[in-house]
């Protein structure tokens, strides 16, 4: 069976720098050539799209400049890695993969990454 | 309701042109190719050609027995494609469709016949 | 470009199974999607990448692939699956798509 299925990583720490990455795998039916990924997040029940970047297969995942997000792509994996979080952005990161050619469109939806992201403790005031 | 719509279908002499229009809403035009299907009275259904999405720079592809005859184009800004046919046969008779695959108009009926 | 071999007809009972094959060299390396094609009606996509079957179709559309035959399934046939069924793949080397030459299912 060819139908496709998307894997994340059910949770990520992210880094004190305000970093995260986690691989999106999908089971591509077919021989796609043009694959979207987008990154959406839900927080208390809201789906907003954190990034996309649409690829020719062979070719590099590249995000808008301004982006948040930036990634590489070998194969049917995805390797995401998101920028700039803080704690209020803690949340569930979908990963939505679209098969865009060849037709028939195809559509796939990981279960979800839970990025939890922790600010840093501000640095103490040191006395000499 | 996604929808293609075809129009643009009727009765044309041998060798005279038709251009047959498809309109799309409510799914992502823009990022799909569209095909042009057709059937002949009692025949299975014939690819004749298709314009990519704007990722692949809407260039086009066509089955053997149409190229050099017929021509596909889009305009994605009115979520439209053509498919414009010259010097038509009478063997072109038939129920043309637009598709993304996913999606298909209803058709029009093209009659070449004199 | 690969040819896609599918019966002309297939009759089945009301409430049996109807298997409708499209035979194609090594067609389990393909996605091989299907359409249902009724008179007068557009053709729909029933299922999709061997199995999957878009929202709107029923359980009882199921489709498999293996070897060199790719396999349509239809269980409690009822009248209103009579049909003209086509199988499709996309031949990667013209990048273009194939269709067989279609299957007419009668339901007796």
């Known amino acids: 069976c060819k139908a496709m299925h998307v894997a994340q990583p059910a949770v990520v720490l992210a880094s004190s720098r305000g970093i995260a990455s986690f691989v999106c795998e999908y089971a591509s039916p077919g021989k796609a050539t043009e694959v979207r990924v987008t990154v959406l997040r839900q927080a208390d029940s809201q789906v907003t799209e954190v990034c996309a970047a649409t690829y020719m297969m062979g070719n590099e995942l590249t995000f808008l400049d301004d982006s948040i997000c930036t990634g590489t792509s070998s194969g049917n994996q995805v390797n995401l890695t998101i920028q700039g979080l803080r704690a209020m952005d803690t949340g569930l990161y979908i990963c939505k993969v679209e098969l865009m050619y060849p037709p028939p469109y195809y559509l796939g939806i990981g279960n979800g990454t839970q990025i939890y992201v922790i600010d840093p403790e501000p640095c103490p005031d040191s006395d000499f | 309701e996604v929808q293609l719509v075809e129009s643009g279908g009727g009765l044309v002499q041998p060798g005279r042109s038709l251009r047959l229009s498809c309109r799309g809403s409510?799914?992502?035009?823009?990022?799909?190719?569209i095909s042009w299907v057709r059937q002949a009275p009692g025949k299975g259904l014939e690819w004749l050609g298709f314009?990519?999405?704007?990722?692949?720079?809407?260039?086009?592809d066509y089955v053997a027995s149409v190229k050099g005859r017929f021509t596909i184009s889009r305009d994605d800004s009115k979520f439209i494609a053509w498919l414009q046919m010259d010097s038509l046969k009478t063997d072109d008779t038939a129920v043309y469709y637009c598709?993304?695959?996913?999606?298909w108009g209803q058709g029009t009926l093209v009659t070449v016949s004199s | 470009q690969p040819v896609l071999t599918q019966p002309p007809s297939v009759s089945v009972a009301p409430g049996k199974t109807a298997r409708i094959s499209c035979g194609g060299n090594n067609i389990a390396s393909e996605a091989v999607h299907w359409y249902q094609k009724k008179p007068g009606q557009a053709p729909v996509l029933v299922i999709y990448y061997d199995s999957d079957r878009p929202s709107g179709i029923p359980e009882r559309f199921s489709g498999s692939n293996s070897g060199n035959t790719a396999t349509l399934r239809i269980s409690r046939v009822d009248a209103g699956d009579e049909a003209d069924y086509y199988c499709q793949v996309w031949d990667r080397t013209t990048d273009q798509p194939v269709f067989g030459g279609g299957t007419k299912l009668t339901v007796l």
């Open positions: 314009v990519r999405s704007k990722a692949y720079g809407e260039t086009t």
């Open positions: 409510n799914f992502n035009f823009d990022d799909l190719a």
């Open positions: 598709t993304t695959f996913n999606y």
